[in-house]
């Protein structure tokens, strides 16, 4: 019921329903780093390093902290108010269309292309055509693969970021 009643007491929070006029919409909600007790009486602190909550909330449980996968490094640990921040290890990157895993960055560009962007944790190396300067988006074998790989071996597509 607390979500439907005008939440009057305290300061603004990020998940208030936009239709309702709320002078102080965190009433009936617990602050970041807490969750509501099952009986609705109190706010209970999340457990540092185990779970977290980022917004004013009426969650019965805090959210479980992410554990970085192998192939990832932990940039910042999980706190009661912020999830773990994981990043791909050097030489690997995470694509928007496959965020579940880090992929190896290509070691070079296809023939006739030059590298204009390095491998970063969020993007593969960036290649452009020597003459036109346009980015390449096709799945083209990298320099080494042109020489060594057998036909049909999949290669990472060039990055479109920039």
């Amino acid at each position: 019921e607390s979500a439907l009643i005008t939440q009057q007491d305290l300061a603004p929070q990020q998940r208030a329903a936009p239709q309702q006029k709320r002078s102080s919409p965190s009433e009936g909600l617990c602050p970041p780093g807490h969750h509501i007790s099952e009986d609705g009486r109190d706010c209970i602190s999340c457990k540092y390093g185990q779970d977290y909550s980022t917004h004013w909330n009426d969650l019965l449980f805090c959210l479980r902290c992410t554990r970085c996968d192998s192939g990832e490094v932990e940039l910042s640990p999980c706190t009661t108010t912020r999830n773990t921040v994981c990043q791909c290890e050097e030489g690997t990157f995470r694509e928007e269309d496959s965020p579940e895993m880090c992929r190896k960055c290509r070691t070079g560009c296809p023939r006739g292309m030059v590298k204009v962007g390095d491998c970063t944790p969020w993007s593969d190396i960036e290649c452009v055509h020597k003459e036109s300067g346009t980015k390449h988006s096709g799945e083209v074998p990298a320099v080494e693969e042109t020489v060594t790989s057998s036909p049909g071996t999949p290669a990472s597509p060039c990055s479109l970021s920039g």
Partner: antibody
Framework: QVTLKESGPGILQPSQTLSLTCSFS??????????VSWIRQPSGKGLEWLAH???????RYNPSLKSRLTISKDTSRNQVFLKITSVDTADTATYYC??????????WGQGTLVTVSA | DIVMTQSHKFMSTSVGDRVSITCKAS??????VAWYQQKPGQSPKLLIY???TRHTGVPDRFTGSGSGTDFTLTISNVQSEDLADYFC?????????FGGGTKLEIK
């Protein structure tokens, strides 16, 4: 708009029972998580929390006064009551009711002065 | 019971100054601490809750900080209307307890 207003006898004698009423508007004590507390303040001194009643009639008391305190409510009439038995001069104070829900006392009444005098 | 100690009963400051009022809890209360302002003849008014969240309508010159056992209410650019008593309170566990109060005097 949330408002609370306390009322009491003003003056009473030692050993009598003090009865206080908190009348409120702008919220319902049937709303989940809602609660009202009684807090007192002797003149020129600090604040002392006395008792709290929740929407579901669960009650909490200050252990130092528990044997003398009774908190109750009438949800339909938007009122909360406090009784203090066997009063003495040390109970002379301004008595406040205040609302809380999952946190601090965000709304307070104006207070009612109670004097215990022989 | 958790004892909330405000070590300064009185603090003197001038208009435009910055003043910090401290409060110490006898045991860890997380961030379940509120600060109230009480002007002469009035009931207390909530300024800060959950240690650092400013209540609706409270000027941004009032800021709260701290967690665990040590808490601070800072008033920057003190105004004459800030003459009042300031109380901290813990709502981490029953019985709820208040600090003894700090009276802010304006020179």
């Amino acid at each position: 708009q949330v408002t609370l207003k306390e009322s009491g006898p003003g003056i009473l004698q030692p050993s009598q029972t003090l009865s206080l009423t908190c009348s409120f508007s702008g919220f319902s004590l049937s709303t989940s998580g809602m609660g009202v507390s009684w807090i007192r303040q002797p003149s020129g001194k600090g604040l002392e929390w006395l008792a709290h009643i929740y929407w579901d009639d669960d009650k909490r008391y200050n252990p130092s006064l528990k044997s003398r305190l009774t908190i109750s409510k009438d949800t339909s009439r938007n009122q909360v009551f406090l009784k203090i038995t066997s009063v003495d001069t040390a109970d002379t104070a301004t008595y406040y009711c205040a609302r809380r829900r999952l946190g601090p006392f965000a709304y307070w009444g104006q207070g009612t002065l109670v004097t215990v005098s022989a | 019971d958790i004892v909330m100690t405000q070590s300064h009963k009185f603090m003197s400051t001038s208009v435009g100054d910055r003043v910090s009022i401290t409060c110490k809890a006898s045991q860890d209360v997380g961030t379940a601490v509120a600060w109230y302002q009480q002007k002469p003849g009035q009931s207390p008014k909530l300024l800060i809750y959950w240690a650092s969240t400013r209540h609706t309508g409270v000027p941004d010159r009032f800021t709260g900080s701290g967690s665990g056992t040590d808490f601070t209410l800072t008033i920057s650019n003190v105004q004459s209307e800030d003459l009042a008593d300031y109380f901290c309170q813990q709502y981490s566990s029953y019985p709820y307890t208040f600090g003894g109060g700090t009276k802010l005097e304006i020179k």
